[in-house]
Amino acid sequence: AGVFELQIHSFGPGPGPGAPRSPCSARLPCRLFFRVCLKPGLSEEAAESPCALGAALSARGPVYTEQPGAPAPDLPLPDGLLQVPFRDAWPGTFSFIIETWREELGDQIGGPAWSLLARVAGRRRLAAGGPWARDIQRAGAWELRFSYRARCEPPAVGTACTRLCRPRSAPSRCGPGLRPCAPLEDECEAPLVCRAGCSPEHGFCEQPGECRCLEGWTGPLCTVPVSTSSCLSPRGPSSATTGCLVPGPGPCDGNPCANGGSCSETPRSFECTCPRGFYGLRCEVSGVTCADGPCFNGGLCVGGADPDSAYICHCPPGFQGSNCEKRVDRCSLQPCRNGGLCLDLGHALRCRCRAGFAGPRCEHDLDDCAGRACANGGTCVEGGGAHRCSCALGFGGRDCRERADPCAARPCAHGGRCYAHFSGLVCACAPGYMGARCEFPVHPDGASALPAAPPGLRPGDPQRYL
């Protein structure tokens, strides 16, 4: 067990041109707060997937009113650290999302309004117990500077907070094979001993004597690969007799969601859908009012002036859930026409149109030939979102500006000589050949060797030669 700590140093305009406008004004004073979401591993998970390592909300910063005419400075920040406790081992690699929120303090109906100013995300490697790591992230024109670290809660120590420290039994040194616990030199490592025989590759323990299996392994010592072939369901019957179990209890066994939350399994963990009035990874945060800012992603909080009356989050387009915590995949409806690429920017949908199409949904087929001139008597032909020129004889290229050499492709067969001509080309055939391209041999009796009629057709019938 341990705590991930995040210290925000500054939030303000980034370097370079296009400084953002201040988020607050004399008419609309505001204050900032931050939300951090942690997930294990280096996964490129969507912003709305559960914060499986934990999440935290900062306090509100000081109220800020923009000075008229002044550029947006670094904005005043909340005091203190954001702390995300973790119960299990520190994973070493993690993904983070840090959101900067603005609370508008004007005369809002139903209390203050929240909107998301910036969201930064990243993936990092971090050993627990190490020094503060400094970071700078940019989101649009904003820049966020922060530091973070992971520290173990006693008696846990080590880079993953899985080793335990105990006070020394003897004043001078630790027992055989046990090292002093840096930085607690007066304590000794007490290694966490898993069940004897527990697979070092596929098993682990969080309590002495146990052997918990990584996903895909089962058995008393986590040595048996999970086979779903004989299972009744993907996790198999809940029985010790089958070899089908995903090892250990399922993530939703015993329902980890508090306060009437419903649990659904995810590939790595679980997700709680919380009833109104509760939120958090396990719906453990209760007595929430609008003053606590429970609506994420710019949701508007209404009601809930006291802990006993529920609040309601009115979600902006693109978000849903009782706390507006889930992003709607609006691109799945394929709103962009004519092969346009859909981009969900959160606050809006954008369609990136293919050449030849335009409009918010790429619905307009541009006149490909408008303003396009084909030189040297060529004519413009529309099609497929691009224009092309059909060039007059003797000319080629995209706009018919290049003089074509009709003989360049050696069109005359059987050694015929090619001559460029104003109307195209002329082939002077070698002896024994005839035709526009010298393609037919001439027989001694003077008949040309045209292809024979296919079986079943009499000479003279209409034919198509292949």
Epitope: V193, R195, A196, G197, Q207, P208, G209, E210, T218, G219, P220, L221, T223, V224, A240, T241, G243, L245
Partner: antibody, heavy 119, light 107 residues
């Protein structure tokens, strides 16, 4: 040294329940699985299931689900197995055993408890 | 469930002999096999773990071998106190299962 002391034998009526105890000494009780094994003459040894006293985590042999249930009291270093709805098929010697510290398997065994079910 | 088959219910031997008790698993259990000795009226005693390692205090005339599905307990220079029933056990899969036992008796 490690010791497992089991409760004495019992003569039980069909349909009744019995609770067998296994008191551990000489080691950290919470940190090692206690295993329960049934032995009937001519039937060899049958594994009933196990409990890790520190966490209360249990695993049962499907065959004994509904018949056996395990508990552990870390304050008295005692593990318990309750057998319910007894029939003559439950007449047997029941052993508790402890999983090894560095070596897997059951290096330590209790002396056994004879349960006899008879009308 | 994994079935541990001890094909010989009884084996006859003499003091000083070398005897091998066999056990066959119905599917691969790696080396997650233990051997136990039980004398009448006593609790089982652990002899071998991980197919071939002796528990502490077990005389070195007891040796275990095998992996996968075929396992053997060999007693070299049999002593009179070795006359007992021997059980194999797999602890690779739940439920843990034992063989039916092989009784070692004097010729």
């Amino acid at each position: 040294q490690v010791q497992l002391q089991q409760s004495g034998g019992d003569l039980m009526k069909p349909g009744a329940s019995v609770k067998i105890s296994c008191k551990a000494a000489g080691y950290t009780f919470s940190n090692y699985y206690i295993e329960w094994v049934k032995q009937r003459p001519g039937h060899g040894l049958e594994w009933i299931g196990e409990i890790l006293p520190g966490s209360g985590s249990t695993t049962y042999n499907e065959k004994f689900k509904g018949k056996a249930s395990f508990t552990a009291d870390t304050s008295s270093n005692t593990a318990y197995m309750q057998l319910s709805s007894l029939t003559s098929e439950d007449s047997a010697v029941y052993y508790c055993a402890r999983w090894g510290a560095r070596e897997p398997g059951f290096p330590y065994w209790g002396q056994g408890t004879l349960v006899t079910v008879s009308a | 469930d994994i079935v541990m088959t001890q094909s010989q219910k009884f084996m006859s031997t003499s003091v000083g002999d070398r005897v091998s008790v066999t056990c066959k698993a119905s599917q691969n259990v790696g080396t997650n096999v233990a051997w136990y000795q039980q004398k009448p009226g006593q609790s089982p005693k652990a002899l071998i773990y991980s197919a071939s390692y002796r528990y502490s205090g077990v005389p070195d005339r007891f040796t275990g071998s095998g992996s996968g599905t075929d396992f053997t307990l060999t007693i070299s220079n049999v002593q009179s106190e070795d006359l007992a029933e021997y059980f194999c056990q797999q602890y690779n899969n739940y439920p843990l299962t034992f063989g039916a036992g092989t009784k070692l008796e004097l010729k």
